[in-house]
């Protein structure tokens, strides 16, 4: 089948990094500068993505693969393939339409991106607050109040802080 196909369509012989040039009797020509073809048999090469301005190049374009971008310092990627760059905020803040705003009381953000999330409610797990929360850090839950009553033979070691979920890239 492959042999039959190549006899019928000379373009199927053109490898990645080339295109089937109709202007030159369907011979395989290398992709011009700033373009690529990631598969064989292409009739055109695709333009390389340009990582300029707020974007910067993470991986250079080659004749067989597109460029990959990330964001300049102070910004982070959003969307598939870093389609957008969003402003970083400080820990303890979240990005709103009006810029970076401090987390409201009772919420925290331990990253430079994403939203402020509520402190863990220790009492839901039958525990007490061992370390108070801040804008930048979740509360640390400790042993239940009953475990701390006088005469208790031992103190339960504090439970590790709940791992905050990471906001999507």
């Amino acid at each position: 089948f492959e042999r039959t196909r190549s006899l019928q369509d000379p373009c199927s012989n053109c490898p990645a990094g080339t295109f089937c040039d109709n202007n030159r009797n369907q011979i395989c020509s290398p992709c011009p500068p700033n373009s690529f073809s990631s598969a064989g048999g292409q009739r055109t090469c695709d333009i390389c993505r340009q990582c300029k301005g707020v974007f910067r190049t993470r991986k250079e374009c080659s004749s067989t693969s597109n460029a990959e971008c990330d964001c300049t310092p102070g910004f982070h990627c959003l969307g598939a393939g870093c389609s957008m760059c969003e402003q970083d905020c400080k820990q303890g803040q979240e990005l709103t339409k009006k810029g970076c705003k401090d987390c409201c009381f009772g919420t925290f953000n331990d990253q430079k991106r994403g939203i402020c999330r509520p402190w863990t409610n220790c009492s839901l797990d039958g525990k007490s607050v061992l370390v108070n929360g801040t804008k930048e850090r979740d509360v640390v839950c400790g042993p239940s109040p009953a475990d701390l009553s006088p005469g208790a033979s031992s103190v339960t070691p504090p439970a590790p802080a709940r791992e905050p979920g990471h906001s999507p890239q």
């Epitope: 011009p32 500068p33 700033n34 373009s35 333009i47 390389c48 993505r49 340009q50 300029k52 301005g53 707020v54 974007f55 300049t72 910004f75 389609s83 957008m84 760059c85 969003e86 402003q87 810029g99």
Partner: antibody
């Protein structure tokens, strides 16, 4: 269909600040580079600067000391401010959208003539 | 004075082929892609070519673009009276972190 429309005063006094707004209708201002380009009478198009939806901006070196841009994502608008204007700033001012992956201006406003005169 | 240079004028009779050059340097055309615009005074500029040689839908195939080294060119084959306009090349300049536009070429159909 996405459209751009420039608005602002058609006459500005010398030494004052020229302020123009470009309203983006029929689509979002998120992503893309939003640019200002001008054409003085009888002269070539001149790139002024761009702003990204997150506020990141860059300006032409020849205008850098006098120009600033801002963006209001809630209103889908971006603005140009050019201070200490002279008669040489008289021009048709265009706002345009630039594709941030392939860096071409694919959508333009109709342009607005700003005259600097006393 | 633009850092990207174009001839101020070009002309041809209907049906002829006209080529406009756009010359730059390593920091702009040499390392970036080029776009071309048609500008009829009193109207908004129109995108003709992007990515050195790609035509947006709706642009006649009489318009073609190419790039080699630090120069680019726009060719108009089968020149028509409605092609009379100013033509501009544009590209990114890495040293400016912004765009540069050529000085424009006025095409006259004789």
């Amino acid at each position: 269909q996405l459209q751009l429309q420039e608005s602002g005063p058609g006459l500005v006094r010398p030494s004052e600040t020229l302020s123009l707004t470009c309203t983006v209708s029929g689509g979002s201002i998120s992503s893309f580079y939003w640019t200002w380009i001008r054409q003085p009478p009888g002269k070539a198009l001149e790139w002024i600067g761009y702003i990204y939806h997150n506020g990141y901006s860059r300006y032409s070196p020849s205008l850098k000391s006098r120009v600033s841009m801002s963006v209001d994502t809630s209103r889908n608008q971006f603005s140009l401010h050019l201070n200490s204007v002279t008669a040489a700033d008289t021009a048709v001012y265009y706002c345009a959208r630039a594709n941030n992956d392939y860096l071409f201006f694919d959508l333009w406003g109709r342009g607005t003539l700003v005259t600097v005169s006393s | 004075q633009s850092v990207v240079t174009q001839p101020p004028s070009a002309s041809g009779t209907p049906g002829q082929r006209v080529t406009i050059s756009c010359s730059g340097s390593r920091s702009n055309i040499g390392s970036n892609i080029v776009s071309w615009y048609q500008h009829v005074p009193g109207t908004a500029p129109k995108l003709l070519i992007y990515g050195n040689a790609q035509r947006p839908s709706g642009v006649p195939d009489r318009f073609s673009g190419s790039k080699s080294g630090t120069s680019a060119s726009l060719a108009i084959s089968g020149l028509q009276s409605e092609d009379e306009a100013d033509y501009y090349c544009a590209t990114w300049d890495d040293s400016l972190s912004g765009w540069v536009l050529g000085g424009g070429t006025k095409v006259t159909v004789l």
